[in-house]
């Protein structure tokens, strides 16, 4: 199709080489009242379109994205050619940063309902640059945490070094929805709820004498509880003795609950005590079996191919630790009678 009639938007993505970062493009198809093309440029004021303008339909999930190759080749369907770019409804998600994402991206409705819809399309010219060292050293992260139940804020990474007074007007989106009243480089969240978790996008306009473009940054916001003040507790084993059959295989499970920590480095391991000696046992990897906002339950098993007489004289100790402290639970094996 002919893309000369598409509206054009220029965007800049300046990514940090130090952090993982995502980016999004919205299919900003023109609203009827703002449109300089689609229906309005085809109809005289007296004419009435026989179809609602595309944006009259709230369903923007039916859009098609293309990339325009720089060599003038035909448009390429994004879904077929770019595995690191994901389409979610009307949004295009770039999962990895890199200058190779630079280029022209075009979106338009999948369903062309009328001849007027042909020019209902947007061309986005995306320029991707790595952040220079000269940029602000303490810019806000692209991953920000909000503490549930308290007051917090979300900062626009590309503007976080500027004071509120000198900051340009910012346009914010949350999960693709425009937050029309938020216009500053920092959103204040009076009280944090689960609702505030999501993908936030901040845009502002930068201009030079020749043209203007939108500088965009994406922030992944996570709602968290405060760091635990407790050391982990062992849920299993509960008993300090375990009846076993000699010569049979045995698996002893250690399950421990770790409270939430922003920097989470849980330790769960098994060691064996035999008279004055003790050594750590090589056991299968620990696995998370339940994770909630407040805590995580982690399990690690010790596997004995067959229980021997020697094992009955040993103590099997599960050791768990977080930044607050550690807990142990020992198990003595006892031969099953009868």
């Amino acid at each position: 199709f002919n893309i000369s009639g598409c509206s054009t938007k220029k965007l800049l993505w300046t990514y940090s080489t130090r952090s993982e970062e995502e980016f999004v493009l919205f299919c900003d198809l023109p609203e009827p009242q703002k449109s300089h093309f689609c229906h309005r440029n085809r109809l005289s004021p007296k004419q009435v379109p026989e179809h609602l303008p595309f944006m009259g339909s709230n369903d923007l999930s039916d859009v098609q994205w293309y990339q325009q190759p720089s060599n003038g080749d035909p448009l390429e369907d994004i879904r077929k050619s770019y595995p690191h770019i994901i389409q979610d409804k009307c949004t295009l998600h770039f999962l990895t940063p890199g200058v190779n994402n630079s280029g022209s991206y075009i979106c338009r409705p999948k369903m062309i309902k009328s001849p007027y819809d042909v020019a209902c399309c947007v061309k986005m010219i995306l320029e991707v640059k790595p952040q220079t060292n000269a940029s602000c050293e303490y810019s806000a992260s692209h991953k920000q945490d909000l503490l549930l139940g308290s007051t917090g804020s979300i900062s626009c990474p590309s503007l976080s070094c500027q004071s509120d007074a000198q900051s340009p007007a910012v346009t914010w989106y949350k999960n693709g929805k425009l937050l029309s009243v938020e216009r500053s480089n920092r959103i204040v969240v009076d009280e944090v709820y689960d609702y505030h978790q999501g993908t936030y996008v901040c845009d502002y306009t930068q201009s030079d004498t020749v043209s203007s473009w939108t500088v965009r940054a994406v922030v992944q916001v996570r709602t968290i509880v405060g760091d635990t003040k407790l050391k982990p507790d062992i849920l299993d084993p509960v008993e300090d003795t375990l009846e076993v059959e000699l010569g049979k295989p045995l698996t002893i499970s250690c399950k421990a609950r770790f409270g939430f920590e922003r920097v989470f480095n849980p330790v769960i391991k098994w060691y064996i005590k035999d008279s004055d000696l003790e050594w750590e046992v090589s056991v299968p990897e620990a696995k998370s079996i339940k994770s909630t906002l407040k805590d995580e339950i982690i399990e690690r098993n010790i596997i004995l191919e067959k229980v021997t007489q020697r094992d009955l004289r040993r103590k099997f100790v599960c050791f768990v630790q977080n930044s607050i402290g550690n807990t142990t639970q020992s198990v003595q094996l006892k031969e099953k009678r009868g």
Partner: antibody
Amino acid sequence: EVQLEESGGDLVQPGGSLRLSCAASGFSFSSSYYMCWVRQAPGKGLEWVACIYAGSSGSTYYASWAKGRFTISRDNSKNTLYLQMNSLRAEDTAVYFCARGAGSNGDFNLWGQGTLVTVSS
Amino acid sequence: DIQMTQSPSSLSASVGDRVTITCQASEDIESYLAWYQQKPGQAPKLLIYRASTLASGVPSRFSGSGSGTDFTLTISSLQPEDFATYYCQSTIYGVNFVPNAFGGGTKVVIK
């Protein structure tokens, strides 16, 4: 008993100023509430004026027409909400209600009985 | 500011009638909408919050529905005490749950 009581309503000349107060009892301002002002002109509908967050951020929110002329504030130690109204006009004549917005629902679950402000020469 | 448009501005109905009032927001407010009832000389009373949740002590004949920009308040069988003015209100402002713009109101009068 949990209640809100407005005071300070009066007859004032156009261009004049007035400060309304709202005393809260039965709950603490420092809790996470939005304390707000809503007005109702005689025979007309409800109109949102402004809100202030009673928690630590103290964020303030205004209807676009109220920005610049009206200022909302609070004194948590006195459990009192204020509305400072300047450059008053005849169209500001209304009953001014104090209301409390709660939690993650954002609705007004508690209202005062209102105080009448009349702007006339 | 968000604009809330309520319709009709008034309606006449009889006891036992099913009454429907609609409210449209100028932008997507998800399900953050409240409905109030106001009688002459009284402060408004909360009926419904979060678009469809009945406030404490409100009779079950009142119900709310909708999300995004279009919302409805329904009174399944109008009672004599229901003749009053009803208002919708947006209860989200950016990312904060700030009660803000009201609709123009719907006056329910006896036919």
